[in-house]
């Protein structure tokens, strides 16, 4: 990601004058190097503050997990604290439901509910007050071409992810389709390989938009192929945040 | 993007004469006279705002870990007018990095950083305060089927765009995958044309979701195929906006 | 929608969900537009139907959203394309689909792409197909800026309130 360092930030110091020039330059640098941190330390000693320390890390989220060195975790910073109590918001993470269905997790990983927002798989998401909400959803899908080769049309699958309003204060009428996305996938097969499944394919179907919701209305996600949902971390989620 | 620093912003400092020697001596005095009070003021100004200190890390989610040294974004470096000073937000635009990498532009075109939000390619995006953020990313990809026809499986490529969190209050260990999109592309070939590349294909992999972040945590994008990124305007970007 | 199985908006089949007059003291500029289903060979944005609305200063002029006040806005748009398979004998030329949100501003002498997605579809290989493109991001906009869209593949749009939309809200 580009080695960004002092050379890139400070320009090239090309001293071609006398020895004194070099000394003077060095003096200037040393002056700065001593004066600034000492002053900083002096001021910080006198002023109450909540600063993080020096952070050095090695981070590679690739195949091997590598160790993070020297992180300073401040004791008062609890990750599960509700950081924004006044704002109705939710972020729900896809989780397998018994019987190959798509369920949603409200507490694990990055999932959360704030400010009276309620959720369960059966009931959907209920927002606590009337307002303008930005609703969003992403569903990751994965699959393989079935064995047997043959007609590519027979292998095509159209994946749909939809967000509906229904139930609660909305009432018992037709659930209202709010936002939806779709993607047709045609998995490939090696013509030479007549038996066996094709390689894994992946796709994501996502969307987001503004919807005016009333307190007690319920919002839920409907998907066409629950058996193809990719539950890998970060792939499948939906949420809402009040914006007005 | 490369190494952005004083060289790019302030010209090269080239001392070539004895006149400069005298200037250098004076500089040393002036340095002290200016550095101390300015540092005091700067520290006093920054402390109440909960600013993080120096961050040094080795973070490359690709194959090689490259080092980013001491990148400090000074508060006065605001690209154009900050239209809403109270709102931490950022929109970064994909730009080629030396060696076929994906870098991010913070000032050109529609890119911006507001309210203490900091960014470097080495360290990612650092948000200045605890809160609920809507994070988003879209990466455009393009390519051609390689020449020679053959096995369609061999032509398939699964493109992934991922958003990770690391550092700060989040603590040590492997960076945390927050949100991810994926798309498998199988470029088609004209069976009549046995040699030469296939037609251009295009796709986009994007997502967005709410994440509760703390000051000092950094967010960065990881992609599977930097060589296939489409840098055309509006195609590749990532950003964050505080919503609560 | 025959052949692709997307159901029309339930709002068309059930009673209209009442529009909300939000009683918040701090209404923020916001807009959500939907593609006009009656215009099959163009993409015209509508703000006065179904769930579409203009709020607190946003206006729609010449098919563009006019930004009411300077600030940071989240801008988003989605389109869904559909099509039928060609007959096996027909030679399938790739279909180029694209959707872009553009900014026209006094600061620029031309339309600037803000959000852009494109896709090549090969209908000959597939039965009826669907493809959606969604994108959204935050932008610093100035009062009077115009937000518009450009789409390639308009005849293939699935024009329903849930599939083709364009919006923005102040942050």
């Amino acid at each position: 990601m580009g080695a960004l360092g002092l050379e890139g930030r400070g320009g090239r110091l090309q001293g071609r004058g006398s020895l004194l020039l070099a000394v003077a330059g060095a003096t200037s640098l040393v002056t700065l190097l001593l004066a600034v941190p000492i002053t900083v330390l002096a001021v910080l000693a006198l002023v109450p503050q909540d600063q993080g320390g020096l952070v050095t890390e090695t981070a590679d989220p690739g195949a091997q997990a590598q160790q993070g060195l020297g992180f300073q975790k401040l004791p008062e910073e609890e990750p599960e604290t509700d950081l924004s109590p006044g704002l109705p918001a939710a972020h729900l993470i896809g989780a397998p439901l018994k019987g190959q269905g798509l369920g949603w997790e409200t507490t694990k990983e990055q999932a959360f509910l704030t400010s009276g927002t309620q959720f369960s798989d059966a009931e959907g998401l209920a927002l606590p007050q009337d307002g303008l909400y930005y609703l969003y959803c992403l569903v990751g899908y994965r699959g393989r071409a079935p064995p047997g080769g043959g007609d590519p049309q027979g292998r095509s699958v159209t994946l749909r992810s939809s967000l509906y309003r229904a139930g609660g204060a909305y009432g018992p009428g037709t659930p209202e389709l709010l936002l939806e996305g779709a993607e047709t996938v045609t998995p490939v097969l090696d013509p030479a390989r007549r038996q066996g499944y094709g390689p894994l394919w992946y796709t994501s179907v996502g969307f987001g938009g503004l919807v005016q919701l009333r307190r007690g209305e319920r919002v839920y996600v409907n998907i066409s192929h629950p058996d193809m949902v990719d539950f890998a971390r970060g792939k499948t989620f939906f949420g809402a945040v009040m914006v007005g | 993007m490369g190494a952005l620093g004083l060289e790019g912003r302030g010209g090269r400092l080239q001392g070539r004469g004895s006149l400069l020697l005298a200037v250098a001596g004076a500089t040393s005095l002036v340095t002290l006279l200016l550095a101390v009070p300015i540092t005091v003021l700067a520290v006093l100004a920054l402390v109440p705002q909960d600013q993080g200190g120096l961050v040094t890390e080795t973070a490359d989610p690709g194959a090689q870990a490259q080092q980013g040294l001491g990148f400090q974004k000074l508060p006065e470096e605001e690209p154009e007018t900050d239209l809403s000073p109270g709102l931490p937000a950022a929109h970064l635009i994909g730009a080629p990095l030396k060696g076929q990498g994906l870098g991010w532009e913070t000032t050109k075109e529609q890119a911006f950083l507001t309210s203490g939000t900091q960014f470097s390619d080495a360290e990612g995006l650092a948000l200045p305060q605890d809160g609920l953020y809507y994070l988003y990313c879209l990466v455009g990809y393009r390519g051609r089927a390689p020449p020679g026809g053959g096995d369609p499986q061999g032509r398939s490529v699964t493109l992934r765009s991922s958003l990770y969190r690391a550092g700060g209050a989040y603590g040590p260990g492997t960076p945390e995958l927050l949100l991810e999109g994926a798309e498998t592309v199988t470029p088609v070939l004209d069976p009549a044309r046995r040699q030469g590349y296939g037609p251009l294909w295009y796709t986009s992999v994007g997502f967005g979701g709410l994440v509760q972040l703390r000051r000092g945590e950094r967010v960065y994008v990881n992609i599977s195929h930097p060589d296939m990124v489409d840098f055309a305007r509006g195609k590749t970007f990532f950003g964050a906006v505080m919503v609560g | 929608l025959p052949g692709v199985g997307l159901t029309p908006s339930a709002a068309q089949t059930a009673r209209q969900h009442p529009k909300m007059h939000l009683a918040h003291s701090t209404l923020k500029p916001a807009a959500h537009l939907i593609g006009d289903p009656s215009k099959q060979n163009s993409l015209l944005w509508r703000a006065n139907t179904d769930r579409a609305f203009l709020q607190d200063g946003f206006s729609l002029s010449n098919n563009s959203l006019l930004v009411p006040t300077s600030g940071i806005y989240f801008v988003y748009s989605q389109v869904v394309f559909s099509g039928k398979a060609y007959s096996p004998k027909a030679t399938s030329s790739p279909l180029y689909l694209a959707h872009e949100v553009q900014l026209f501003s006094s600061q620029y002498p031309f339309h600037v792409p803000l959000l852009s997605s494109q896709k090549m579809v090969y209908p000959g290989l597939q039965e009826p197909w669907l493809h959606s493109m969604y994108h959204g991001a935050a932008f610093q906009l100035t009062q009077g800026d115009q937000l518009s869209t450009h789409t390639d593949g308009i005849p293939h749009l699935v024009l329903s309130p849930s599939t083709v939309f364009f919006g923005a809200f102040a942050l």
């Epitope: 439901l97 019987g99 269905g101 798509l102 309620q118 369960s120 798989d121 059966a122 009931e123 959907g124 209920a126 229904a166 139930g167 609660g168 204060a169 009432g171 018992p172 009428g173 037709t174 659930p175 007690g216 319920r218 839920y220 409907n222 998907i223 066409s224 192929h225 629950p226 | - | 159901t7 339930a10 089949t13």
Partner: antibody, heavy 116, light 107 residues
């Protein structure tokens, strides 16, 4: 006109299974959830579970998860409930009801009698 | 599971009367309460959803109110066709549960 037409009464032996049906007409079958309830003689209603005809996803009251299996046949716009390992306590009238939570249309009920 | 209690299992009233049937939940159900009418022949109809919203086609003589754990159904100007058993149902927390029913008879 919306109608939910349930299958006729059933007399079954203990330990056996029975599959009752609910034929929907007059609306888009995949657009609404289908619920199932039971009412034992002279008693109140109990909610058994709900199925989404669009994709077959179902939710069960834990009390009935080993007793009932919900399915749909989209081609015939019919919802089915199979009752397993029946005992005399399963003798009741079973209803289907359309709705996400509140149910605006109900079937006429299917009487199931478990007796040797 | 949330328990729904209808304290009055049967009541009788005269034609033209105003009748109130109450229902209590074992915990706060945030207005997610529904009322049904079951006629003597077993036919079930939806009357009210989300505490107070009248289902289409239901006469305005029927009304609902309440919050938290306490809810009620009121029938004003009682008519012969109102002879039925009335059930409350919570749809706040899975699994949905019904009250024991209140059988209304005409004096």
């Amino acid at each position: 006109e919306v109608q939910l037409q349930q299958s006729g009464p059933e007399l079954v032996k203990p330990g056996a299974s029975v599959k009752i049906s609910c034929k929907a007409s007059g609306y888009s079958f995949t657009g609404y959830f289908m619920n199932w309830m039971r009412q034992s003689h002279g008693k109140s209603l109990e909610w058994i579970g709900r199925i989404n005809p669009y994709n077959g996803d179902s939710f069960y009251n834990q009390k009935f998860k080993d007793k009932a299996t919900l399915t749909v046949d989209k081609s015939s716009t019919t919802a089915h409930m199979e009752l397993l390992s029946l005992t005399s306590e399963d003798s009741a009238v079973y209803y289907c009801g359309r709705g996400y939570d509140a149910m605006d249309y109900w079937g006429q009920g299917t009487s199931v009698t478990v007796s040797s | 599971d949330i328990q729904m209690t209808q304290t009055t299992s049967s009541l009788s009233a005269s034609l033209g009367d105003r009748v109130t049937i109450s229902c209590r939940a074992s915990q706060d159900i945030s207005n997610f309460l529904t009322w049904y009418q079951q006629k003597p022949d077993g036919t079930v109809k939806l009357l009210i959803y989300y505490t107070s919203k009248l289902h289409s086609g239901v006469p305005s003589r029927f009304s609902g109110s309440g919050s938290g754990t306490d809810y009620s159904l009121t029938i004003s100007n009682l008519e012969p066709g109102d002879i039925a058993t009335y059930y409350c149902q919570q749809v706040s927390k899975f699994p949905w549960t019904f009250g024991g029913g209140a059988k209304l008879e005409i004096k």
